[in-house]
């Protein structure tokens, strides 16, 4: 039976009738309308934006359209007191400061609330000292600064260059290198494309241009001041000092002309290999402190932001499901902005927004989804996925039962070269049969399909003539429903070519220069790659909505698990000598994926012969595919992590925009030849070989015949 | 019970080539990665190469010069070596994981 048919609705009414009526032009207005002024988490005019969305939801057509409020933790420059970083000469005279804000674009003069670059959630301070280059701030390059070449970070202030990991992860480790502050840079290496104009002549970063970002380390926590609950009327708060994943240090984001000046004088160690040099004409030495010359002088950080619990408001839309009311599918994305969030996020609110009016269009002329689709327009993302979090944690009793999926919506864009889809495995088969129907928007592909073009410019490194999907990591409002609550969840976008653009996320995010202009102009002047991320998403979202049976495959798991499995092991077996000696068997691991592979084909087998038209039994089934992701969760949760449950998928440790797999496994053997006691280590790795191996058998088990 | 036997090492001169086998029986070898680890005299046990459902991995000592590959119809690992160096002389294992080893064939690279 088709899904029209289930819901008794005219044949018009499908796929074909939404996507039809889907517009470019309304996106471009929607974007235009959403970028006038700053949408900053907290402030009233992203309070406005909440009602005029909530307003123009009712009016598309939805059954009803709430505001969810909270009263979270967030973070803000002090409006007369400036945050800054000086040199300093041996009196202690400031010979140089870094600028207090960006130069504003063209058009944006006059535009009051522009929040100054800041790092959200910093502590105060006026730390000095000498500084130390830590490159990316990742886990190696401490490794490599204080492993091979000996440099103490203790005391002092490092400045590491943003990009390939979240900035929360390069202030956790310098923290736990002894450094008193940290100061982020962007370098042209990573955020100026060769051959492109700076902003407002192209998409490029100028040398002013800073981005901004918050730098907790939450783990999935929500509100730092309530951990597992919501922050609602009657919430009881931590104190500060309990507060969940602060910094501890000073931190604060400058530009590459700042960044110019501090680095320029830079003395001490060489840098160890060429992959420490960015592209300014500076040489990258490591330190610590200055050169002969300027060995006297000393940075100095200026920091003066305050937390403040605030009020929050989340935008949550209802479209009822006319024979499965009770289960959940969800389209959600932020609202809220560092400054104008020309891409992030309001291409993709403006996706959203053109999404709902598709919908409430189909709905007034009497067509409704056969499951409820419900709409989120989220707060404070930008500050630790905040409104995401305490709404589904205010929820969480009826996401568990009713949870079919959800889908992500923030940026549309991050470049315009090709499709960029990050997802749980059981959304594979959606997403390729989905992109088979959707023509290309790509020069070259007239008349092909998206598939076609995706798969192209992205191939998968697996699998012939298929496209690359990833795996979900974080920093995104999936985190939640994924990470937490085991709610299958996907994620789509329009990217760049990363083999030819190795520069980090797109140069100018999180600026003052992230604009409608640098939209309309730069990125999609057509707004053809936004309507094929609508048609994406929203194709997503009908048919996790709409068709009888859920469009998911269990199969896929499986393959993946294997290929998961593979990857451990061999991480593993790295280690022969500890393995033998602590007697490490992955036999348990493999006999699980074995298990779980055979009772995958065995249930498929079922899903194509079952009575379609018996509602009991199709429920069942249903219910044993939307309940396969809910079952990789550990109630328990991760060593130290407790709020990352999955056990086949969590953020990394060491960057947590990156998903890893087999994660309790994988932190286990890290860096397992440095620890003190080997025998403790080799006992943690095979008890999470346990954990995994009992996840991955217990989850297979709940797709077996049910008697 | 589980059972692993390699075979096919021996003497070669350098820049040659030899080709390991390990026959695996007592379990549903398709199912399980494999591993091939060598121990040279007086020295460590060293990971060479590792081998899942259609993936593999290589230690970075014989990268470009290895191949793993196994033949499941026939419950069979194998190494291919080739531009052997003097320094791949060892006794190499094959190995299922911690627990489960062969007891090795020894490659000597010598002129």
């Known amino acids: 039976k088709s899904s029209n048919e289930a819901t008794n609705i005219t044949p018009k009414h499908n796929m074909k009738a939404f996507l039809d009526e889907l517009k470019a032009e309304n996106i471009k207005k929607f974007l235009y309308n959403f970028t006038q002024i700053p949408h900053l988490a907290g402030t009233e005019q992203n309070f406005q934006l909440a009602k005029q969305i909530q307003s123009q939801w009712k009016e598309f057509g939805l059954d009803s359209v709430e505001l969810a409020h909270y009263d979270v933790l967030l973070s803000y420059p002090n409006k007369t007191h400036p945050n800054y970083i000086s040199i300093i000469n041996e009196d202690g005279n400031e010979i140089f400061n870094t600028s207090l804000f960006e130069p504003p674009p063209p058009g944006y003069e006059n535009v009051s609330d522009i929040v100054p670059p800041f790092s959200a959630f910093s502590p105060q301070g006026m730390p000095e000292g000498d500084l130390v280059y830590v490159n990316y701030a990742r886990t190696e390059d401490f490794f490599k600064l204080e492993r091979d070449m000996k440099i103490n970070c203790s005391g002092k202030i490092v400045i590491a260059r943003y990009g390939k990991v979240f900035r929360g992860n390069k202030v956790k480790n310098a923290q736990l290198a002894g450094a008193k502050g940290v100061i982020l840079y962007s370098d042209p290496a990573d955020y100026f494309a060769p051959g492109v104009k700076s902003y407002p002549d192209g998409w490029n970063l100028p040398g002013g241009g800073v981005q901004r970002g918050n730098i907790l380390n939450l783990n999935g926590a929500g509100d730092p001041l309530t951990p597992g609950y919501p922050a609602n009327e009657y919430a009881y708060r931590r104190g500060i000092a309990e507060a969940v994943g602060l910094p501890s240090i000073p931190v604060h984001p400058i530009g590459y002309y700042d960044a110019q000046k501090l680095l320029e004088k830079m003395g001490g160690s060489a840098p160890p290999d060429s992959s420490w040099r960015g592209s300014l004409k500076v040489p990258y030495n490591v330190g610590p402190g200055f050169t002969g010359n300027f060995s006297t002088q000393k940075v100095k950080m200026h920091i003066h932001s305050t937390n403040e619990v605030t009020r929050i408001y989340n935008v949550i839309g209802t479209l009822r499901g006319a024979v499965e009311p009770d289960r959940y599918v969800i389209l959600g994305g932020h609202r809220d902005s560092w400054v104008f969030g020309g891409i992030d996020p309001q291409s993709g609110a403006a996706v959203v927004h053109e999404i709902v009016r598709s919908f409430g269009t189909l709905k007034k002329e009497g067509w409704r989804p056969r499951r409820t689709i419900l709409f989120a327009s989220w707060d404070a993302e930008e500050f630790g996925l905040l409104g995401s979090t305490e709404w589904a944690e205010e929820n969480s009793r009826l996401l568990q039962e009713r949870g079919v999926a959800y889908i992500n919506a923030d940026s549309s864009i991050e470049g315009n070269y090709t499709l960029r889809v990050d997802c749980t495995p059981l959304m594979y088969s959606l997403v390729h049969n989905l992109t088979k129907e959707l023509k290309s928007p790509d020069e070259g592909f007239e008349g092909k399909s998206l598939y076609e073009s995706w798969t192209k410019k992205s191939p998968s490194p697996e699998f012939s003539g298929m496209p690359r999907i990833s795996k979900l990591g974080s920093g995104n409002d999936f985190e939640v429903f994924f990470q937490r609550l085991g709610i299958a969840s996907g994620r789509a976008r329009y990217t760049k070519n990363w083999e030819t653009n190795k520069f980090s996320g797109y140069p100018l995010y999180h600026s003052v220069y992230e604009t409608y202009e640098l939209v309309e102009k730069f990125y999609d002047p057509m707004f053809k790659y936004h309507l094929t991320v609508a048609q994406v998403r929203g194709g997503m979202v009908f048919e996790l909505a709409n068709s009888i049976v859920l469009p998911f495959d269990c199969r896929d798991y499986a393959v993946v698990l294997r290929k998961y499995a593979d990857k451990i092991y061999s991480i593993s077996m790295k280690h022969p000598q500890e393995m033998k000696t602590y007697s490490v068997s992955f036999d348990s691991l493999f006999s699980a994926v074995k298990n779980f592979t055979e009772i995958a084909s065995k249930f498929s087998e079922r899903l194509q012969d079952f009575d379609k038209s018996n509602p009991i039994v199709l429920r069942m089934m249903n219910d044993q595919l939307m309940f396969l992701e809910r079952a990789f969760i550990d109630p328990l949760g991760l060593p130290d992590r407790p709020f990352y449950r999955h056990v086949i998928y969590a953020p990394s440790s060491h960057n947590k925009y990156a998903g890893e797999s087999f994660p309790g496994i994988y932190d286990a053997l890290f860096d397992i030849e440095s620890k003190v006691d080997p025998s403790k280590a080799w006992g943690e790795v095979k008890r999470q070989i346990y954990v995994a191996a009992f996840t991955v058998q217990a989850a297979a088990e709940t797709l077996s015949e049910v008697a | 019970e589980v059972q692993l036997v390699e075979s096919g090492g021996g003497l070669v001169q350098p820049g040659g080539s030899l080709r390991l086998s390990c026959a695996a029986s007592g379990f549903t070898f398709s199912s399980y990665a494999m591993s091939w680890v060598r121990q040279a005299p007086g020295k460590g046990l060293e990971w060479v190469s590792s081998?899942?459902?259609?993936?593999?991995y290589y230690a970075d000592s014989v990268k470009g010069r290895f191949t793993i590959s196994r033949d499941n119809s026939k419950s069979t690992l194998y190494l291919q070596m080739n531009s052997l160096r003097a320094e791949d002389t060892a006794v190499y294992y094959c190995?299922?994981?911690?627990?489960?080893w062969g007891q090795g064939t020894l490659v000597t690279v010598s002129s």
């Open positions: 190995a299922k994981d911690g627990v489960h």
């Open positions: 081998i899942g459902d259609g993936t593999t």
